[in-house]
Interface confidence: low
């Protein structure tokens, strides 16, 4: 991941990059690679699309080793096959109010976003789409056995669903803060992303964060108890180091991830934090990273269409952050 | 052609200090870092520490307290500084270019004697 | 007991494939550890074989790779020939340091 090597390329001559991504030179000089793309890592290794006004954008002069591929200031966004310019706001639909910065979108959900966990009163929450009304309801189905209800409910716990409220106002500056994006990746290392004005200044900046769902290594399907369908949060194993891009933390963590369901059912972070973390890399570096860490996952039927750009961006964020 | 070449005493005292230095050439200091390594008569190698090229050190945690590496890039030189030498220091110290350990110096033997 | 532990001594006859494990007693060996295989000839300086698990060094013939499985890195030697008689050691890095296995004697047999 850094150029202090002699140049050792694969074997093959150049690799085949899906359509639309650029076939570029590493930021060595040495490799012909596929080109990062927006929001994607990158190094100095592994260089942003050119062709595309992308950079490597690396947050803090401390942190030159990995960076998120970024537009370059005023890059204007696309989004359903309209150009937007940088800082521009609009109602994507009546679900969603967006805002364009630097290339990218970000936006806030309009409609009530919380992940209803089974309580007594509504041991079968459903949400579903009424007639006239933009926004899902929560609907309460009644059990096609009801003699399961009492003593499943005994393994149910009421969860805080909502996180901090996005808007505020301070000092002639209406605070809006999206919610953080679902993390890029369903195992193993990804980013979360999220579009803020929350500065002094009241600009609209982009931050991003690391975040792991579950690792990829790990077979969660198989710890699954006889009888269900569900690991929400599979136990805590032995504390680990993360790994980014050859990087090591510096600090073990006894980090929390989402487990799996067999049942078409998504388990995705509820309830998450963020936090600094150290990574020290081979050439002696040490850089600060945001992370997410996970407090609580939360299983449920709510997951993303591939056929709706809406659902599958935004039915996936993640609430209560406390940071 | 990429070379390193240690040069230093051969004899040191007890408690002497002992400084080697790692002249390189056909590659730049900025661009790769330097490792040191010694190797005891009969015994394995030893890792000892390095310096990045960006100037950062890394050292063996058992040496921690008597290492010191620096490097002049414009010179091409890199300076290995270790005090309070004992016979059980008595080995062939080699540098080798970081990235692989691909290019090693001949070695220099560095007797720690009375 | 050392961190990083390799045999003491291996063998094969020539035109036959050898390989040389390098075991991590701290756990799975991972990219981050940036396995490192080092030969020394019998009086002669080292040359890197092999950096950052499966990078052949330049100049080095591709009867050298480098692997890594579980908590073993392995250097594997195919069409053994008289010339590779020599001293094979193995680096990993440690987050803060490298860590040389003890080397491993490979003879040519015949």
């Known amino acids: 991941q850094n150029c202090s090597g002699p140049c050792r390329c694969p074997d093959e001559p150049a690799p085949r990059c899906p359509a639309g991504v650029s076939l570029v030179l590493d930021g060595c000089g040495c490799c012909r690679v596929c080109a990062k793309q927006l929001g994607e890592l990158c190094t100095e290794r592994d260089p942003c699309d050119p062709h595309k006004g992308l950079f490597c954008h690396f947050g803090s002069p401390a942190n030159r080793k990995i960076g998120v591929c970024t537009a370059k200031d005023g890059a204007p966004c696309i989004f359903g096959g309209t150009v937007y310019r940088s800082g521009e706001s609009f109602q994507s639909s009546c679900k969603y109010q967006c805002t364009c910065l630097d290339g990218a979108v970000g936006c806030m959900p309009l409609c009530s976003m919380d992940v209803r966990l089974p309580s007594p009163d509504c041991p079968f929450p459903r949400r579903v789409k009424l007639p006239g009304k933009c926004c899902e309801e929560w609907v309460c189905d009644e059990p096609k056995d009801q003699t399961v209800v009492g003593p499943a409910l005994a393994a149910y716990r009421l969860e805080d669903t909502f996180g901090p409220d996005p808007t505020m106002i301070r000092a002639n500056c209406l605070v809006q803060t999206t919610e953080w994006s679902a993390c890029s990746k369903t195992c193993g290392m990804g980013i979360s992303t999220r579009v803020t004005n929350d500065n002094a200044s009241c600009r609209l900046e982009k931050q991003s964060r690391l975040c792991m769902v579950r690792p990829c290594e790990a077979d969660l399907e198989e710890n699954i108890k006889k009888g269900k369908k569900c690991i929400r949060t599979p136990k805590i194993s032995k504390p680990i180091k993360f790994e980014l891009s050859g990087c090591t933390s510096m600090k073990t963590y006894r980090a929390k991830f989402c487990g799996v369901c067999t049942d078409g059912r998504c388990c995705t972070p509820h309830r998450t934090t963020t936090l600094p973390v150290e990574f020290k890399c081979p050439d002696g570096e040490v850089m600060k990273k945001n992370m997410m860490f996970i407090k609580t996952c939360a299983c449920h039927y709510n997951c993303p269409g591939d056929n709706d750009i809406f659902e599958s961006l935004y039915y996936r964020k993640m609430y209560g952050d406390m940071a | 052609e990429v070379t390193l070449k240690e040069s230093g005493p051969v004899l040191v005292k007890p408690t002497e200090t002992l400084t080697l230095t790692c002249t390189v050439s056909?590659?730049?200091?900025?661009?790769?870092?330097v490792h040191w390594i010694r190797q005891p008569p009969g015994k394995g190698l030893e890792w000892l520490g390095v310096?990045?090229?960006?100037?950062?050190?890394d050292y063996n945690a058992a040496f921690m307290s008597r290492l010191t590496i620096s490097k002049d890039t414009s010179k091409s030189q890199v300076v290995f500084t270790m005090t309070n030498m004992d016979p059980v220091d008595t080995a062939t110290y080699y540098c080798?270019?970081?990235?692989?350990?691909?290019?090693w110096g001949q070695g220099t033997t560095v007797t720690v004697s009375s | 007991e050392s961190v990083v532990t390799q045999p003491p001594s291996v063998s094969g006859a020539p035109g036959q494939r050898v390989t040389i494990s390098c075991r991590s007693s701290?756990?799975?060996?991972?990219?981050?550890?940036?396995a490192n295989w080092v030969q020394q000839l019998p009086g002669t300086a080292f040359k890197g074989l092999i950096g950052?698990?499966?990078n052949r060094a330049p100049g080095v013939p591709d009867r050298f790779s480098g692997s890594k499985s579980g908590t073993s890195a392995s250097l594997a030697i195919t069409g053994l020939q008289a010339e590779d008689e020599a001293d094979y050691y193995c680096a990993l890095w440690y987050s803060t340091h490298y860590v040389f296995g003890g080397g491993t004697k490979l003879t040519v047999l015949g």
């Open positions: 950052g698990t499966s």
């Open positions: 080798a270019r970081d990235g692989g350990f691909d290019y």
């Open positions: 701290i756990g799975a060996v991972t990219t981050s550890n940036y």
């Open positions: 056909g590659f730049s200091l900025s661009t790769f870092g």
């Open positions: 310096i990045w090229r960006r100037g950062g050190t």
